[in-house]
Interface confidence: low
């Protein structure tokens, strides 16, 4: 809390300008009118105030707007945004994408802070859904943003927004999140032809069911091992050796290097050894020839 002291003669700020960087903290408190500050916030970001000076400016705005800042002020906060607490931000009503971009720019290059997370939450809730422009903006600043959302939150993403998603945006998503995103991606890309479709859908396949993988195996897609290793184990297990061979194409040889890792390991355990032998890769651990193979899905249906 800054003490209330009278402004020295001749130091009353008539404008927000660079000369204010030469004011001591108490002078800023005494000589800068909060309303003037609010109307000239666009200048503050271009003035090299110290963190201590920014504290004083924030204090003045807090006094002027105890219920939360108006968007006209928020849009021009600049470095002052770094001084805001999540509690401050919860009082805001941010509706403009330009405001969101301006504040994300301030935090650019850093991890998502609690302030930024709160800001995004307020913004998205205010809009009611994660529209394409918002998602474009958020993933541009935070490639991992999508994967930080819960499956429930992801359910509000409209299929049209999926066009904004880049492969790297999904790197840290877990299967539960991909389960939600995959059907949206399928819908978004449904009018594309085979090869183009596969390029777009590839990043989302961690949420694909068995029947879609079977369909892809008929389309000469040549899925790479990295994508295959991210598939749901329960979706891979029912695939036949022939289907996996078609799905992977020339990449099938990579199965040998991954034979001890899921989902390859579990898939091998479900295949007849003589079927695996047809691949000529030396994959071991399949069901020995002559053994009865129960269709586990059928068994579950009967029980």
């Amino acid at each position: 809390e800054v003490e209330k002291t009278a402004c020295p003669s001749g130091k009353k700020a008539r404008e927000i300008d660079e000369s204010l960087i030469f004011y001591k903290k108490w002078e800023l408190e005494a000589c800068v009118d909060a309303a003037l500050l609010a109307t000239q916030m666009d200048r503050v970001n271009a003035i090299p105030f110290t963190y201590e000076q920014l504290d004083v400016l924030k204090h003045k705005l807090d006094e002027l707007y105890p219920q939360g800042y108006p968007e006209s002020v928020i849009q021009h906060l600049g470095y002052l945004f770094l001084k805001m607490s999540p509690e401050d931000i919860r009082k805001w009503n941010v509706t403009s994408l330009e405001t969101l971009k301006a504040l994300l720019e301030v935090n650019k290059g850093h991890e998502m802070s609690p302030q930024v997370a709160t800001l995004i939450d307020r913004f998205v809730k205010g809009r009611g859904q994660l529209d394409k422009d918002t998602l474009d903006t958020l993933t541009a600043f935070y490639p991992g943003y999508l994967c930080s959302l819960s499956p429930e939150e992801l359910s509000s993403v409209p299929p049209s927004s999926i066009w904004a998603v880049r492969p790297q945006d999904l790197d840290t998503c877990d299967p539960r999140q991909l389960d939600v995103l995959y059907p949206k991606a399928r819908l978004a890309f449904q009018n594309m032809n085979g090869s183009e479709y596969f390029v777009k859908i590839q990043s989302f396949l961690g949420g694909a069911p068995t029947e879609d993988l079977k369909a892809l195996s008929q389309q000469n897609v040549s899925m790479d091992l990295a994508t295959f290793m991210k598939l749901r184990t329960d979706a891979v297990l029912p695939l036949t050796v022939a289907e996996v061979q078609k799905l992977l194409g020339p990449h099938v040889e990579g199965l040998k290097a991954e034979e001890r890792h899921r989902p390859v390991r579990d898939w091998i355990l479900r295949q007849r050894q003589d079927d695996l032998d047809t691949l000529g890769l030396g994959l071991q651990g399949g069901i020995p020839n002559g053994y009865l193979v129960l269709d586990l899905s059928m068994q579950e249906a009967l029980s």
Epitope: E15, E18, S19, F22, R43, N45, A46, I47, T50, Y79
Partner: antibody
């Protein structure tokens, strides 16, 4: 790229008026302060004042207050330095320079090439 | 006004040598609000160091700034032929901002 381009050299007589210019490009001109710096022949640098082009708010060094006028036309990203009545002692190289941004600013990070003003009868 | 005094006025060195330039302020320059500029004959100044020790974009690592309070130093670890120029310090802590009178680094 970010640059400031100044108008060409001027030769004037004492008592004449003059307005030199500094055009910014490659960045958002209205979002940075522009300062003017004088360098007399064989001498060092002297800070004259600055302007916020967005609304043309200016501030001057006490040594130059009332001697020169700093202005800007944001529509053409140009700042100006002008004299209403030149003196021989105004003979110098004049530089415009951009203030660096935000907390890391205050220093002059981009400079114009300079405008040489010669005042002689 | 804060007066900045640079020393020496001239520094005569050979390429490869280390150059140490001093800038002393008449009163404390707080928050490290001090910059260094390089100026070659017929050219505009160029920002080298801001915040007393931070190198500006594109400035070679051989340039380094240090100091606080009233004493600041610009060091060029190993002089290259293109480093022979005049160097100015500037404070932007007190109003108005002021420059030192400059140190000329010349070839010995």
């Amino acid at each position: 790229q970010v640059q400031l381009v100044q108008s060409g050299a001027e030769v004037k007589k004492p008592g004449e008026s003059l307005k030199i210019s500094c055009k910014g490009s490659g960045y958002s001109f209205t979002n940075y302060w522009i300062g003017w710096v004088r360098q007399m022949p064989g001498k060092g640098l002297e800070w004259m004042g600055f302007i916020w082009p967005s609304d043309s708010w200016t501030s001057y060094s006490p040594s130059f207050q009332g001697q020169v006028t700093i202005s800007a036309d944001k529509s053409i990203s140009t700042a100006y330095l002008q004299w209403s009545s030149l003196k021989a002692s105004d003979t110098a190289m004049y530089y415009c320079a951009r203030y660096g941004h935000g907390m890391y600013g205050g220093a002059l990070d981009v400079w114009g090439q300079g405008t040489l003003v010669t005042v002689s009868s | 006004d804060i007066v900045l005094t640079q020393s020496p006025a001239t520094l005569s060195l050979s390429p490869g040598e280390r150059a140490t330039l001093s800038c002393r302020a008449s009163q404390s320059v707080r928050s490290s609000r001090l910059a260094w500029y390089q100026q070659k004959p017929g050219q505009a100044p160029r920002l080298l160091i801001y915040g007393a020790s931070k190198r500006a974009t594109g400035v070679p690592a051989r340039f380094s700034g240090s100091g606080s309070g009233t004493d600041f130093t610009l060091t060029i670890s190993s002089l290259e032929p293109e480093d022979f120029a005049t160097y100015y310090c500037q404070q932007y802590y007190d109003f108005p901002p002021t420059f030192g009178q400059g140190t000329k680094v010349e070839i010995k």
